[in-house]
Amino acid sequence: HGTELPSPPSVWFEAEFFHHILHWTPIPNQSESTCYEVALLRYGIESWNSISNCSQTLSYDLTAVTLDLYHSNGYRARVRAVDGSRHSNWTVTNTRFSVDEVTLTVGSVNLEIHNGFILGKIQLPRPKMAPANDTYESIFSHFREYEIAIRKVPGNFTFTHKKVKHENFSLLTSGEVGEFCVQVKPSVASRSNKGMWSKEECISLTRQYFTVTN
């Protein structure tokens, strides 16, 4: 029955650390019975492996079948539309999915106050799917960096930025009081990976946190 259906216009990965999601755009005028077949190719093993015969969503979680991503040459994925006995041509991801494509995140940020300083501790991601030995700090073992952004609330869109090279950091508030909110964006200096801003953590600074010294 050939290739009567149009192909998905685009296919791409959106990945965080051990959270590898394949996305695609729907074919135009798809019917209620249209679904999508997903296949995966691991570089070095030059054959396509069928992952899902009929996904009715526009994304598929490939984490479980790409757990070795961080120790491999990467993957390509392809998707085609299926409707009954008809199917489209395959649409293949146009870039190799490798560790370089993983967007870096932090798990959370903890804040406390000490003598007018905001002290922060960055918790690294600990995804459930990750094998025990594949921690964030073992895979990205060197040159971890973090952009820290702080804003005073209420306020508008004004952030003050600072770059740090450790999971622990301190911020001087210049004697100001009020609520301060912090977001963190990770990077690795030796890599090209993008980073995502963390969830905002806020802390209230009042006069009681300042020690008077002569």
């Epitope: 959106e14 996305h23 994304s59 952004a149 963390s198």
Partner: nanobody, 127 residues
Amino acid sequence: QVQLQESGGGSVQAGGSLRLSCAVSGYSYSSNCMGWFRQAPGKEREGVATIHTGGGSTYYADSVKGRFTISQDNAKNTVYLQMNSLKPEDTAMYYCAAEPLSRLYGGSCPTPTFGYWGQGTQVTVSS
């Protein structure tokens, strides 16, 4: 590739209304910080409003609170800025921006930086 396409700008009298649209394509839409920014001639770009597309929370600059409303249509991958009671000082080029947020760990809006920007749409308010 990611594309943000703004529309809906134009010229209007003071007190009038406009509705700007920003259509997102090229990446998934489920968890992002989407923002509207503006830049008047000779001035720095300033934030106007943001929306968290996953949670729906919104944030506004003081100068537009009560007059502007940011909203989303998930089915159309589109974010809107409804601008009412427009003033001459609202005259500017308006830009749509997007920053992906973590699906695993969440994120907040506004983000300190935005990675994707549209080309802008001009809004002119005359007195």
